[in-house]
């Protein structure tokens, strides 16, 4: 009679985490009499997975009814697979012996690899805002995937970025892995509406990559440009001076008018107009009663934007340039009259 062979037809199988793994094993003969055992690994450190004869193996079920007299199928199913279950599984035939059964023949082994999906990528930007032309770093992290092979790409508004560094940890063997990538992005004034996207592709995702995003609106600070202009005379002895605050982001802005270096009025930006690029404009104006001044007046519009050092723009108001109109019956007003923004 031909000697018994233990056949494990699958050299390797791959199973998604959470699913069941079926490990196939058949024997070619009913002789010698004795049980089958399944082990993970080989040698003295191997781990018993299933013993036909005895023991409690809650995650393991047999595919066939082993109590049937002529059964030669000793395949097993392991439920709820996790990455920790990866390894090489051996189906081993034992010969009945006294006092102990004796190992008779082993199958060639089936390598079980476990596929685990990466977590949704989390993108984080710098702690502090930065201004256009500056380079900022974004990080992307994803965890818990297996196998180790993974692809990560960075995009800004759909355009792929090339300046990034990626590490997959650990470098050695592990039940699951993590990826960490840092991308460098140069900010432009138009980036308020921009998005940075980290895209992760893995065998478990079946061609549908995971994405994590960061809005550059959380990262960018666009400083305002200031323009102070003198409007034509509105009424007798009064000049309208406006401070146009343009193209700034975020909204947080405080404006102070100074008259010859002395604080005249402070106001906080409200009723802003939004530009197409996401930046804001604002305007503040003053009515100046020139009749109250003997000398020229230096008017300064000082803006503190988003907690940054103040920027300012000045305008010299020439008193001589506004002669008093004859026959005026308007009583002289205060030197400076505040006005709501237009």
């Amino acid at each position: 009679e031909e000697e018994l062979q233990v056949i494990q037809p699958d050299k390797s199988i791959s199973v998604a985490a959470g699913e069941s793994a079926t490990l196939h094993c058949t024997v070619t003969s009913l002789i010698p009499v004795g049980p089958i055992q399944w082990f993970r690994g080989a040698g003295p450190g191997r781990e018993l997975i299933y013993n036909q004869k005895e023991g409690h193996f809650p995650r393991v079920t047999t595919v066939s009814d082993l109590t049937k007299r002529n059964n030669m199928d000793f395949s097993i199913r392991i439920s709820n697979i996790t990455p920790a279950d990866a390894g090489t599984y051996y189906c081993v035939k034992f010969r009945k012996g006294s006092p102990d059964d004796v190992e008779f023949k082993s199958g060639a082994g089936t390598e079980l690899s476990v596929r685990a999906k990466p977590s949704a990528p989390v993108v984080s930007g710098p702690a502090a805002r930065a201004t256009p032309q500056h380079t900022v770093s974004f990080t992307c992290e994803s965890h818990g995937f297996s196998p180790r092979d993974i692809t990560l790409k960075w995009f800004k508004n759909g355009n792929e970025l090339s300046d990034f560094q990626t590490n997959v940890d650990p470098a050695g063997d592990s039940v699951s892995y993590s990826i960490h990538s840092t991308a460098k992005v140069v900010l432009t004034r138009e980036d308020v509406h921009s998005q940075v996207i980290c895209e992760v592709a893995h065998v478990t995702l079946q061609g549908d990559p995971l994405r994590g995003t960061a809005n550059l609106s959380e990262t960018i600070r666009v400083p305002p440009t200031l323009e102070v202009t003198q409007q034509p005379v509105r009424a007798e002895n009064q000049v309208n001076v406006t401070c146009q605050v343009r193209k700034f982001y975020p909204q947080r802005l405080q404006l102070t008018w100074l008259e010859n270096g002395n604080v005249s009025r402070t106001e906080t930006a409200s009723t802003l107009t939004e530009n197409k690029d996401g930046t804001y404009n604002w305007m503040s104006w003053l009515l100046v009663n020139v009749s109250a001044h003997r000398d020229d007046v230096k008017l300064t519009c000082q803006v503190e934007h988003d907690g940054q050092p103040a920027v300012s723009k000045s305008h010299d108001l020439k008193v001589s340039a506004h002669p008093k109109e004859q026959g005026s019956n308007t009583a002289p007003g205060p030197a400076l009259a505040s006005a709501a923004p237009l």
């Epitope: 003295p44 191997r46 051996y90 081993v92 190992e103 008779f104």
Partner: antibody, heavy 122, light 112 residues
Framework: QVQLQESGPGLVKPSETLSLTCTVS????????WSWIRQPPGKGLEWIGF???????FYQSSLKSRVTISLDTSKNQFSLKMTSVTAADTAVYYC????????????????WGQGTTVTVSS | DIVMTQSPLSLPVTPGEPASISCRSS???????????LDWYLQRPGQSPQLLIY???SRASGVPDRFSGSGSGTDFTLKISRVEAEDVGVFYC?????????FGQGTKVEIK
């Protein structure tokens, strides 16, 4: 191709602890046993012990009380710690990979480090 | 522990001639599966040991076919069909059936 590299101090004082690390490059830790073997000057090979990739350890009975072998799969490294050393522990220490294909035994120590000389002296 | 005994302990050889080394184990290395857990190693001067034969008779990767292993149970032989100058060094047999792994005392092969 797999390479092993031992690292650690070449001189240890008597009664102190000998610590060696072996870094595995170019291959996986999984499915192998990772062994420490030593060779005293002018003598033969003495097996100290090994660790399986699943963390199970086996030691030479005469050294068991003094020896610990540990594995850091994340770094692809395994380590040997031997306490209370004496001059008799002076040797070339090799780290090595032992294959296991099936069954209860092993299939040869197929990859060896270049060895590191450890001298126990005050 | 399984005790491994080699003979001879020293073997002067002539290049081109055959050579053989014996190894005896204190208990059978033939496992119930029919596998023999006996290995042969060569340690060249100043180098680490290298695996020549495993499983009693299987040549390790890259080992020249002039090396062959035979034997079963407790008696084993390593044969070199034609010795070459690079074969000088110490040959060790080792058992891998059970822990502790044990080695023979070594056979020093040198050119006559």
């Amino acid at each position: 191709q797999v390479q092993l590299q031992e690292s650690g101090p070449g001189l240890v004082k008597p009664s102190e602890t000998l610590s060696l690390t072996c870094t595995v490059s170019g291959g996986s830790i999984r499915d192998y046993y990772w062994s420490w073997i030593r060779q005293p000057p002018g003598k033969g090979l003495e097996w100290i012990g090994f660790i399986y990739y699943n963390g199970r350890t086996f030691y030479q009975s005469s050294l068991k009380s003094r020896v610990t072998i540990s594995l850091d799969t994340s770094k692809n490294q395994f380590s040997l710690k031997m306490t209370s050393v004496t001059a008799a522990d002076t040797a070339v220490y090799y780290c090595a990979r032992v294959r296991a294909y099936s069954g209860i035994g092993l299939d040869g120590t197929d990859v060896w480090g270049q060895g590191t000389t450890v001298t126990v002296s005050s | 522990d399984i005790v491994m005994t080699q003979s001879p302990l020293s073997l002067p050889v002539t290049p081109g001639e055959p050579a053989s080394i014996s190894c005896r184990s204190s208990q059978s290395l033939l496992y119930s599966t029919g596998y023999t857990y006996l290995d042969w190693y060569l340690q060249r001067p100043g180098q680490s040991p290298q695996l020549l034969i495993y499983g009693g008779s299987s040549r390790a990767s890259g080992v020249p076919d002039r090396f062959s292993g035979s034997g079963s149970g407790t008696d084993f032989t390593l044969k070199i069909s034609r010795v070459e100058a690079e074969d000088v060094g110490v040959f060790y047999c080792g058992q891998a059936l059970q822990t502790p792994l044990t080695f023979g005392q070594g056979t020093k092969v040198e050119i006559k």
